[in-house]
Amino acid sequence: KAMHVAQPAVVLASSRGIASFVCEYASPGKATEVRVTVLRQADSQVTEVCAATYMMGNELTFLDDSICTGTSSGNQVNLTIQGLRAMDTGLYICKVELMYPPPYYLGIGNGTQIYVIDPEPCPDSD
């Protein structure tokens, strides 16, 4: 059977440019190694935002220079994207891959529309 991935339809980033959402997958197999990727879809272009591989029961580790952080609990991943600006508003897709043991499984969510509003600059005080 194919793997199903669920994620929220819409998330509003905080005034500090931080957006968090949960990505949940229904695992058809007993995976010990899982890869989670956040993709951004703009028009028909899909680009990778960040990716992390983790062993089941261990923490999710993104690269040091990644704009993403995350935690995992069972078949659920809590993802946080930082440093977002208004121009980053768009559809963010959660992709889950069961890497080991074989067989490999792919699961792709429908995407979370993240809205980012740049904060108004503070007015100069007299």
Epitope: K1, L39, L106
Partner: antibody, heavy 105, light 102 residues
Amino acid sequence: PGRSLRLSCAASGFTFSSHGIHWVRQAPGKGLEWVAVIWYDGRNKDYADSVKGRFTISRDNSKNTLYLQMNSLRAEDTAVYYCARVAPLGPLDYWGQGTLVTVSS
Amino acid sequence: QSPGTLSLSPGERATLSCRASQSVSSYLAWYQQKPGQAPRLLIYGASSRATGIPDRFSGSGSGTDFTLTISRLEPEDFAVYYCQQYGRSPFTFGPGTKVDIK
């Protein structure tokens, strides 16, 4: 038959280590047959039953190169072998031009 | 995949079918291959057109039954078409449908 051969596939124009890469083959006048895949850092691999134990897929991310080591070759391994990149959403979006491998007695 | 061969004239509509033995959700792609060339991605996710693919090509279906439709055949569309599931390994291809000129 019984001989060995190593195929290589050099990639450019994209971040090689961010993509899985497949080998797909096509026997003369026949359809496409999936052979093997290798993922990202090269630790995770998968093979078709028809080549398991005889073929080994590997990659060198520092050289942006994919390999297929083919041992104990049989006449039925005669085919054009294609390397193909996995797109972010899963399908095979870019294919090599193919290499013809002929196994004859 | 069915039919094995489809004989049609330019301007006609082509309907190609692909059936999976078990559900592959929407993890299905269609490829076009011309003689002496590598396959080219047409459709992914069952219904999304790949970059640069004309809108006369469309895909539909989910689960086990999928369709590739070419609304009006152009001379360059006469080729072999393959479906492939990519939701799990092994990544199987269909046997192909040849669209040739009647």
